[in-house]
């Protein structure tokens, strides 16, 4: 039998994207990053 149509079956988890800029001292500039779900990826 052919299968009926359904979704992929995978849960969709909505994650928060957080852009941040952190001042690390006048002579070192700034760190700019992107945190996805609590993990810094850039």
């Amino acid at each position: 039998d052919a299968e009926f149509r359904h979704d992929s079956g995978y849960e969709v988890h909505h994650q928060k994207l957080v852009f941040f800029a952190e001042d690390v001292g006048s002579n070192k500039g700034a760190i700019i990053g992107l945190m996805v779900g609590g993990v810094v990826i850039a």
């Epitope: 039998d1 052919a2 299968e3 009926f4 149509r5 359904h6 979704d7 079956g9 995978y10 969709v12």
Partner: antibody
Framework: QVTLKESGPGILKPSQTLSLTCSFS??????????VGWIRQPSGKGLEWLAH???????YYNPSLKSQLTISKDTSRNQVFLKITSVDTADTATYYC????????????????WGQGTTLTVSS | DVLMTQSPLSLPVSLGDQASISCRSS???????????LEWYLQKPGQSPKLLIY???NRFSGVPDRFSGSGSGTDFTLKISRVEAEDLGVYYC?????????FGAGTKLELK
Amino acid sequence: QVTLKESGPGILKPSQTLSLTCSFSGFSLSTSGMGVGWIRQPSGKGLEWLAHIWWDDDKYYNPSLKSQLTISKDTSRNQVFLKITSVDTADTATYYCARRSITTVVPEDYFAYWGQGTTLTVSS
Amino acid sequence: DVLMTQSPLSLPVSLGDQASISCRSSQSIVHSNGNTYLEWYLQKPGQSPKLLIYKVSNRFSGVPDRFSGSGSGTDFTLKISRVEAEDLGVYYCFQGSHVPLTFGAGTKLELK
């Protein structure tokens, strides 16, 4: 709230074509993942699934009746239609439409909402 | 077609009893996405069917917790822990994994 209501001719003669309409409110078939199906029930007997149509016009039919069935929709009027050609006395039944949704926004992949049914009698 | 076999076809009970309805499918109804689309519906005389359980064991909103569904593969069960008068009617199992979608023949829950 979601409501569905079926309408049909009530009585037909054998060999005629049955045209059913399901008019619904509370959702739109233009919404990704939405679908409406048809199920019938001869008096005092069990339920038989007939056909289903999805928002993107993807259609599924019961293979045992596929040559007789045509399901279609009018998205702007919130209606779904079922045609059954060459009806016989065995097609005497109550016909229901029901909603099923596979969208992640409304993940209701089950027949949670049904119409009240419309009764067809096929008699010569 | 996937044949859904329910037993018993008639189930006489007294109010307050536990009731158990079996549903067996003629083949696995596990979909390729990993879900099992096994549902239970209750139909009372003169009414359209009402959803009780979806995906084997999930109670639909508003369904009392005396209803529970279980099973896997081809063997499924609906249990009602304490039958109330409003529970009387015909129970149908249903598979939504394979075309054609199919219902069991129904189990009539009635008073002894």
